[in-house]
Interface confidence: low
């Protein structure tokens, strides 16, 4: 066999190669260190693989904050969690890295985090309205298409990464631990995403995936929240992961995607893939969450759930979706679109950022080149707006 | 190369209007949000409001709501604002940016 | 709106000096903030943007930085070209808002 068929994202593919070796190269990044002392450890919030997660206070000006202890890996993990953090600091939505630390007994290195009074999302999403999910669905969107314009897959979109302050109507996406830097034609690592929100291209161990991974697990989380079934694919193991999706895409489709990129399958896959058809998305709906479906949620939740990573919506098209509509409108009413700095998103409480009525950011950051959607810039500072400029 | 190229200086009588306009060359018109900015020694630098040339979308600040207009020609690539009705106070450097700076255009209002 | 409070308003330094230019945020804008440099004949470009990252053909001379509030632009050898006018730019709240300026002048 000749082995798998090159890929390229079709947006934002070359914007590492027009940048300087040294915004990708995050193993010569210098880590420059604040001070533990600054910080008061106040209560534990959580722990995952790779961290522990505490709320704390900056005693030097009383602020609370977030203190994500790392745990010990590969030191060149750390720096590329902490490059990625710096290069997208001030993005819409992205949450915002405040100083890096070093406990000053064992040594472990602590990034320090803005503060986010987040509900919990199985408490939250149970709750949240037609409205709410486009709004934050759209959010996420803005932080995603940042995200993608400055070269950098996320790898690991679930609800526990997306920080929701919903009396603020305030979001961030969290965890930068798996992102990485998108270069054409190399090949990654599939063992990244959490198992419900993995991509076919992981599944199929095809190594040569982009931005595109993002929006599968974008469309996993849609899926979720208007059909209220959390997870909406839910596999015992990854095996298994692909075999769900299957049952919903159908196999026909698979295979499909397998011959055009001429990925070979896991023989394992053999005796359990079995053959599906194609199920429509209204199959789905029942009373419980036919107030949150819509046919242009179908259409978009269609356009993002599709085997071949080259044919998902990406970020940028994905939010001049019809289903952002409303959104979209009453955003640019209110004045709002998600500016650099932390921005949230206008609605009914802050206005923390923004340009107001323009669903595309830039502020005047560079008041030279403030991307159109990508956000953020303000007054001069060319980031690509979406598609754009540094293709 | 990127460029932002305003239109020229304009003396006005009070009351009247006045259409500036900045064409953009060197990169893509509709990838990135327009600002406009005024300038007079008095208030310093003053952020006027945004126009998403993509969408047609604008934002203002409130202090300039009314005053100016902001709209964009995708197939020029230009960018234009509109002030109304104006006095000496509206006697300023106007700046659009974009990708980058633009050149300029002074106004002044005088009988 | 944020005011933004720039100092000093003007400066005198000499060729190779270090100097600092500093503007205080009325409220918290996080690392949103960018530096401006103006020269004698209008024409504008930015030096600094998210507080500290230099945008790309500024020389490294220039670095910005923040304290709390106060973010600082830095001048580490002055050059005969930076004898200019400098702004800082909030934008992390609707409307911007710059600073008043420093006006750099050579001693």
């Known amino acids: 066999m000749s082995g798998p068929v090159p890929s390229r994202a079709r947006v934002y593919t070359d914007v590492n190669t027009h940048r300087p070796r040294e915004y990708w190269d995050y193993e010569s990044h210098v880590v420059e260190w604040g001070n533990q002392d600054d910080y008061q450890l106040v209560r534990k919030l959580g722990r995952g693989k790779y961290s522990e997660v505490f709320e704390a206070i900056n005693i030097t000006n009383n602020e609370k904050v977030v203190v994500k202890i790392l745990k010990p890996v590969k030191k060149k993990k750390i720096k590329r969690e902490i490059k990625i953090l710096e290069n997208l600091r001030g993005g819409p939505n992205i949450i915002t890295l405040a100083d890096i630390v070093k406990d000053p007994v064992s040594r472990t290195p602590a990034l320090v985090f803005e503060h986010v009074n987040n509900t919990d999302f199985k408490q939250l999403y149970q709750t949240l309205t037609d409205y709410d999910i486009r709004f934050y669905m759209y959010e996420i969107l803005k932080a995603l298409d940042y995200c993608h314009s400055m070269g950098i897959m996320h790898r690991d979109v679930k609800p526990h990464n997306v920080m929701i302050d919903h009396e603020h109507r305030k979001l961030r996406l969290i965890d930068w631990g798996l992102a990485e830097f998108y270069h054409p034609g190399q090949e990654y690592n599939v063992r990244v995403a959490s198992r419900y929100f993995k991509g076919p291209e992981l599944l199929v161990d095809y190594q040569m995936y982009d931005y595109s991974l993002d929006m599968w697990s974008l469309g996993c989380m849609l899926a979720s929240m208007i059909f209220r079934k959390e997870p909406f694919f839910h596999g015992h193991d990854n095996y298994d992961q692909l075999v769900r999706i299957a049952k919903v895409l159908g196999t026909e489709d698979l295979y499909d995607y397998i011959d055009k990129y001429n990925i070979e399958l896991d023989p394992r896959f053999n005796d359990i893939l079995g053959r599906h058809s194609r199920k429509r998305w209204e199959r789905f709906v029942h009373s419980e969450n036919q107030h949150l479906v819509s046919p242009e949620a179908l259409d978009f939740l269609d356009k993002l759930l599709r085997y071949d990573h080259q044919s998902r919506l990406t970020a940028r098209e994905a939010m001049e979706h019809p289903y952002f509509y409303t959104v979209v409108k009453d955003q640019a009413r209110m004045g709002s679109s998600s500016m650099p700095g932390g921005s949230t998103p206008v609605s009914s409480a802050n206005m923390m950022s923004g340009i107001s009525s323009v669903p595309t950011p830039s502020p005047l950051g560079p008041l030279a080149g403030s991307p159109v959607i990508a956000a953020a810039n303000p007054l001069g500072m060319p980031v690509p707006a979406a598609a754009g400029a540094q293709q | 190369q990127v460029q932002l190229q305003q239109s020229g200086a304009e003396l006005v009588r009070p009351g009247a209007s006045v259409t500036l306009s900045c064409k953009a060359s060197g990169y893509k018109f509709t990838d990135y949000q327009m600002h406009w900015v005024k300038q007079t020694p008095v208030h310093g630098l003053e952020w006027i409001g945004v126009?998403?040339?993509?969408?047609?979308?604008?934002a203002y600040n409130q202090k300039f709501r009314g005053k100016a207009i902001l709209t964009a020609d995708k197939s020029s690539s230009t960018a234009y604002m509109e002030l109304r009705s104006l006095t000496s106070e509206d006697s300023a450097v106007y700046y659009c940016?974009?990708?980058?700076w633009g050149t300029g255009t002074t106004v002044t209002v005088s009988s | 709106d944020i005011q933004m409070t720039q100092s000093p308003s003007s400066l005198s330094a000499s060729l190779g000096e270090r100097v600092s230019l500093t503007c205080r945020a009325s409220q918290d804008i996080g690392s949103s903030l960018n530096w401006l440099q103006q020269e004698p004949d209008g024409t504008i470009k930015r030096l600094i943007y998210?507080?500290?990252s230099l945008d790309s053909g500024v020389p490294k001379r220039f670095s910005g930085s923040r304290s709390g509030s106060d973010y600082s632009l830095t001048i580490s050898s002055l050059e005969s070209e930076d004898f200019v006018d400098y702004y800082c730019?909030?934008?992390?709240?609707?409307?911007?808002?710059f600073g008043g300026g420093t006006k750099l002048e050579i001693k």
């Open positions: 126009l998403d040339p993509g969408t047609g979308g604008t």
């Open positions: 940016t974009g990708f980058v």
């Open positions: 998210a507080t500290s």
């Open positions: 730019l909030q934008y992390a709240i609707f409307p911007y808002t």
